[in-house]
């Protein structure tokens, strides 16, 4: 999916109002220095591509993020403010139901969410630069 035509202001507002709080809650008990940020993004569409990938694509050591509250809110935000995104999720949603996994917060998941926080902050910064 090409995130070029999204309403970035609306996405930023949703992130600042609610998604950021859920990400921070997930990370509670860990320090920001516990993990190094290894994933970056260069512009707003690129940041959203990386955020989508890290939030919804299961990895061998962290398969459960898509069911978290911040992930559900991220999905809703992209579906609402990115033209045509919801259509791309119809088959993806059905596939995700089939591979539902037990929720476990592993250190690898905490690291992945730390990367997500970094990507979202980068997304906000690129937005501010444009303004």
């Amino acid at each position: 999916y090409d995130f070029t035509n999204c309403d970035f202001q609306k996405i930023e507002a949703d992130y600042l109002r609610t998604i950021s709080k859920d990400l921070i809650t997930y990370m509670s008990g860990t320090k920001s220095t516990d993990f190094n940020n290894t994933v970056s993004c260069s512009n707003r569409p690129h940041c959203l591509t990386e955020i989508q990938s890290l939030t919804f694509n299961p990895t061998p050591r962290c398969a459960s993020l898509a069911k978290e509250m911040f992930a559900r809110k991220t999905k809703a935000t992209l579906a609402l403010w990115c033209p045509g995104y919801s259509e791309t999720q119809i088959n993806a949603t059905q596939a995700m139901k089939k591979r539902r996994k037990r929720k476990v917060t592993t250190n690898k998941c905490l690291e992945q969410v730390s990367q997500l926080l970094g990507l979202w902050r980068r997304f906000i910064r690129t937005l501010l630069k444009k303004q």
């Epitope: 109002r17 559900r72 999905k75 579906a79 609402l80 033209p83 045509g84 919801s86 259509e87 949603t93």
Partner: antibody, heavy 120, light 107 residues
Framework: QVQLVQSGPEVKKPGSSVKVSCKAS????????MHWVRQRPGQDLEWMGT????????DYNQNFKGRATITADKSTSTAYMELSSLRSEDTAVYYC?????????????WGQGTLVTVSS | EIVLTQSPGTLSLSPGERATLSCRAS??????VHWYQQKPGEAPRLLIY???QSISGIPDRFSGSGSGTDFTLTISRLESEDFAVYYC?????????FGRGTKVEIK
């Protein structure tokens, strides 16, 4: 089963406000946005706006911006649409309709409609 | 905003005949089009979503096709309860919009 039950008919004077409610049951309220659509007598459907409980945000059709306010009470699974500065052209049936925001993404259940008549 | 143009405005057919309803978008909207049926005094009822996805409980004589700007709702064999107004709606981007409807009436 999924049900959206709207408040009863209203007769209002021009310049006044009306608040229509939509009580949802049979599903998880925060998994769906609540849209409001109106239909003037003998006319087509017109999207007014939506409230997304999961994100605590709303969006409006520019035609209604400033006059329509869409809210929700998550504790009672009830959505509200308030329309102010009413004029005779606002005489219409007002519908609420749910739309999945993390799946389905379509208005798959509708309220029965609320007739609002604006007359002096 | 995206404008949806439905044609024809009215379709006069007999039970058992095939109905073909058209919906054209003013810009590319991929497959983000949904079809609703509305009878007098009732709320709209969802028939088809995302151009061609069927809904459980809706008879399989209703089918949808199309992508980009041109969409079609087909009713393979009209039954007496199918005479109603049909609307297309886009959810590609805000503000969501509806077509002006096609009335399917008994000939």
């Amino acid at each position: 089963q999924v049900q959206l039950v709207q408040s009863g008919p209203e007769v209002k004077k021009p310049g006044s406000s009306v608040k229509v409610s939509c009580k949802a049951s049979g599903y998880i309220f925060t998994d769906y946005a609540m849209h409001w659509v109106r239909q003037r007598p003998g006319q087509d459907l017109e999207w007014m706006g939506t409230f997304i409980p999961l994100l605590d945000t709303s969006d409006y059709n520019q035609n209604f911006k400033g006059r329509a306010t869409i809210t929700a009470d998550k504790s009672t699974s009830t959505a509200y649409m308030e329309l102010s500065s009413l004029r005779s052209e606002d005489t219409a049936v007002y519908y609420c309709a749910r739309m999945g925001v993390t799946h389905s993404y379509v208005m798959d259940a509708w309220g029965q409609g609320t007739l609002v008549t604006v007359s002096s | 905003e995206i404008v949806l143009t439905q044609s024809p405005g009215t379709l006069s057919l007999s039970p058992g005949e095939r109905a073909t309803l058209s919906c054209r978008a003013s810009q590319h909207i991929s497959r983000s089009v949904h079809w609703y049926q509305q009878k007098p005094g009732e709320a709209p009822r969802l028939l088809i979503y995302f151009a061609s996805q069927s809904i459980s409980g809706i008879p399989d004589r209703f089918s949808g096709s199309g992508s980009g700007t041109d969409f079609t709702l087909t009713i393979s064999r009209l039954e007496s309860e199918d005479f109603a107004v049909y609307y297309c709606q886009q959810s590609y981007s805000f503000p969501y919009t509806f077509g002006r409807g096609t009335k399917v009436e008994i000939k």
